[in-house]
């Protein structure tokens, strides 16, 4: 068993060098954006119709292109529960510097949990999704 | 209506230490990341400290690592910079900030007027 | 270090007319999420800054629709389509990127 988990260990780490979870974490972070924009709360009120067209984030059409392409790259965690879960919490470390607000990161992690389920894939049953408050300090 | 107040400032002689302090109302203080930026006399800009909501990271700029502590009292609203081992070219007013969420400086206190001076 | 270099360093303005800074970083401001961590803040004379624009492009709440940020990368501009006397003051642009760097500053005064 043990070595057999030391294989699946040695996958998965081969499975995540290999993904690109860039169209993942484009497509959260769009996505909470664009929900405190539309929702007008603190820190910022939308000052435009939060649809209308920007060369960032209100292209609805990038974001679900982003989804799309991130699908596609959690599908290859599909048969790992484990796996799935590394993904996602890759997915939170590289992120997480960029949330500089309580509620930005809990936000953040709602729709991770939920990224895999709107993918039509299962999701992890137990995947701590947990980083310091406020991000790493790397520089 | 959010208000931040900075307080402590002063004339102090190089060397010395100080504390500043930054009072926060009408704002979720222990939900954001705060900073500290400061501007000397006639000049721009300078990003110094930053601290995230919990305490848990810091951030500092080159030219006040080592010397500088950034903390923060949650329970009291409060935001704290304590300059050691202070340079004339730390002369400046001291403003603090509270962070947007997504790494903005969003709402700035008026300033409080540091002088190293011997 | 990521440096910003902004120009004009002062700029003449007559009001009515536009105006438009430029803001140049080190490297590219573009994080892995596809935003761009450049802000543009004002400071009136004897005021604390303000928040104009962050994420490059995006005003922040209650500023008015004349100022406008755009660019990606490494080349920023932040635009004033029609100056008013109450614009006057020292403009910023700042990186977010890796924690946070300033430009030096482009003082708009009235001609």
């Known amino acids: 068993r043990q070595q057999w988990e030391l294989q699946g260990d040695r996958r998965c780490q081969s499975q995540l060098e290999r993904a690109n979870l860039r169209p993942c974490e484009q497509h959260l972070m769009q996505k909470i954006q664009r929900d405190e924009d539309s929702y007008g709360r603190d820190p910022y009120s939308p000052s435009q119709d939060p649809y209308s067209p920007s060369p960032y984030d209100r292209r609805g059409a990038g974001s679900s292109q982003h989804q799309e392409r991130c699908c596609n790259e959690l599908n290859e965690f599909e048969n790992n529960q484990r796996c799935m879960c590394e993904a996602l919490q890759q997915i939170m470390e590289n992120q997480s510097d960029r949330l500089q607000g309580r509620q930005q990161e809990q936000q953040f992690k709602r729709e991770l949990r939920n990224l895999p389920q709107q993918c039509g894939l299962r999701a992890p049953q137990r995947c701590d999704l947990e980083v310091e408050s406020g991000g790493r300090d790397r520089y | 209506q959010v208000q931040l107040v900075e307080s402590g400032g002063g004339v102090v002689q190089p060397g010395r230490s100080l504390r500043l302090s930054c009072a926060a109302s009408?704002?979720?203080?222990?939900?954001?990341?705060m900073h500290w930026v400061r501007q000397a006399p006639g000049k721009g800009l300078e990003w110094v400290a930053a601290?995230?909501?919990?305490?848990?990271?810091?951030y500092y700029a080159d030219s006040v690592k080592g010397r500088f502590t950034i903390s923060r009292d949650n329970s009291k609203n409060t935001l704290y910079l304590q300059m050691n081992s202070l340079r004339a070219e730390d002369t400046a007013v001291y403003y603090c900030?509270?962070?947007?969420?997504?790494?903005?400086?969003?709402?700035w206190g008026q300033g409080t007027l540091v002088t190293v001076s011997s | 270090d990521i440096v910003m270099t902004q120009s004009p360093l002062s700029l003449p303005v007559t009001p009515g007319e536009p105006a438009s800074i430029s803001c140049r970083s080190s490297?590219?401001?573009?994080?892995?999420?596809?935003?761009?961590?450049l802000d543009w803040y004002l400071q009136k004379p004897g005021q604390s800054p303000q928040l104009l624009i962050y994420?490059?492009?995006k005003r922040a709440s209650g500023v008015p629709d004349r100022f406008s940020g755009s660019g990606s990368g490494t080349d920023f501009t932040l635009k004033i389509s029609r100056v008013e006397a109450e614009d006057v003051g020292v403009y910023y642009c700042?990186?977010?990127?890796?924690?946070?760097?300033f430009g030096q500053g482009t003082k708009v005064e009235i001609k």
């Open positions: 900030a509270r962070d947007s969420g997504y790494r903005s400086l969003l709402h």
């Open positions: 009408g704002i979720a203080f222990n939900d954001y990341t």
């Open positions: 601290i995230s909501y919990g305490g848990t990271n810091k």
């Open positions: 490297q590219s401001l573009v994080h892995r999420n596809g935003y761009n961590y």
């Open positions: 994420m490059a492009s």
């Open positions: 700042m990186q977010a990127l890796q924690t946070w760097t």
